[in-house]
């Protein structure tokens, strides 16, 4: 299901297309850069490392898991000044649903 | 500059050199004499957007931090069973 | 060194097309996305597209939106900006640049005129 | 969308200093391009990234930026540096150009 990143409350919020937007399915957690970087050439680091192959906006990660793989995401490109952080922390389970 | 997330128990607390900032999301508490910010228990799924406070001069070194906690407390497994 | 070196610009009739080609060295072209700028008689700059660097992501201005095509072959270092149902309002000099936002680089312009 | 703000035009006298402004909301989050361009020539990048100059542009011309304003300096102005300056940041993808500064070197 789509668990894109809600305000809580009413204050002044940053704009949408600077928000990550994280999507779990099953096992499977794809989460997606800001979109702030039109059309650059995007980078990924996990925990300060660069991740190699990954240049899209989109990173995924098919058998996510809860121990290895939460962390600190960043993804940047040559022509932003900042780069935008993530602080992932997920459980994941292959048969679930998530009911509110 | 950067916020950073710690687990301390079952509680995710953000920390800065300077104070922690809410853009949106979930509110948290300011720890007293501190600068932390408490986000609650990880099992409420905090999310949300911070940063650390800095001065106008500096706040160009000061990014954004997004929170992302989905701990599947409300999974329900889908098997033969619950399908039918 | 760097070298952006833009054609393709003519006298074009409105309603017709065009291809701009911008043929790139100096550089490991596939590593930087490509952009074109135009800047219209005695007016401003205005970013018209831009493409990632494998041509995956573009981006166009609203006013050309449906009109215009940017490519590039990375075998060629060559980007192009395909450009069909030409309006008055596309006179302009295009000029290709390196990079995608902080562009270090622009070529010398072709010049696109449309009237009829 | 984002906006730039520049004066539409500054006065230098010959070899002394020039600075020209570009007023953005927070614009020290962005990176900051100027952009040289002489009457009847292509423009041409002097400064990419705030501050650095591309090869083969001369040291007199620097950049700054932080809060809500960035700046170009030209120290020791020359005849040759009459022309008119834009601004550019790349915001959400699309670049964002200032309307331009026309700057007149005073003999």
């Known amino acids: 299901q789509d668990e894109d990143f809600k305000a809580s409350d009413d204050l002044t919020s940053i704009s949408p297309e600077k928000r990550f937007k994280v999507s779990i399915s099953g096992t499977e957690v794809v989460v997606t850069c800001p979109d702030v970087f039109g059309y650059d050439n995007i980078k990924w680091e996990k925990n300060d490392n660069l991740v190699e192959g990954a240049s899209n906006r989109e990173l995924s990660q098919k058998e996510f898991s809860e121990v290895d793989d939460s962390g600190y995401y960043a993804c940047y490109a040559d022509s932003i000044k900042e780069k935008s952080y993530l602080y992932l922390r997920a459980r994941v389970c292959a048969n679930c649903i998530e009911v509110n | 500059f950067k916020v950073s997330v710690e687990e301390l128990e079952d509680r995710v607390f953000l920390s800065c050199n300077t104070s922690v900032l809410r853009i949106e999301g979930t509110m948290g508490i300011q720890l007293p004499h501190s600068r932390t910010l408490d986000l609650g228990k990880r099992i409420l799924d905090p999310r949300g957007i911070y940063r650390c406070n800095a001065t106008e001069e500096q706040s160009d070194k000061a990014p954004y931090m997004q929170v992302y906690y989905r701990m599947c407390q409300n999974c329900v497994e889908l098997n033969s069973a619950t399908l039918a | 060194e760097v070298q952006l070196v833009e054609s393709g610009g003519d006298l074009v009739k409105p309603a017709g097309s065009l291809r701009l080609s911008c043929v790139a060295s100096?550089?490991?072209?596939?590593?930087?996305?490509m952009s074109w700028v135009r800047q219209a008689p005695e007016k401003g700059l205005q970013l018209v597209a831009g493409i990632n660097g494998d041509g995956s992501t573009t981006y166009y201005t609203d006013a050309v939106k449906g009109r215009f095509t940017i490519s590039r072959d990375n075998a060629k270092n060559t980007v192009y900006l395909q450009m069909n149902s030409l309006r008055a309002e596309d006179t302009a000099m295009y000029y290709c640049?390196?990079?995608?936002?902080?562009?270090?680089?622009w070529g010398q312009g072709t010049l696109v005129t449309v009237s009829s | 969308s984002y906006e730039l703000t520049q004066p539409p035009s500054v006065n230098v006298t010959l070899r002394e200093t020039a600075h020209i402004t570009c007023g953005g909301a927070s614009i020290g989050r962005k990176y900051v391009q100027w952009i040289q361009q002489i009457p009847g020539q292509a423009p041409v990048v002097i400064i990419y990234k705030d501050s650095n100059r591309p090869t083969g542009i001369p040291e007199r011309f620097s950049g700054a930026n932080s809060g809500n304003t960035a700046t170009l300096t030209i120290s020791g102005a020359l005849a040759e540096d009459e022309a008119d300056y834009y601004c550019q940041v790349g915001d959400s993808g699309a670049w964002v150009f200032g309307e331009g500064t026309q700057l007149t070197v005073l003999r």
């Open positions: 100096g550089f490991t072209f596939s590593d930087y996305s």
């Open positions: 640049a390196k990079g995608a936002g902080t562009g270090d680089f």
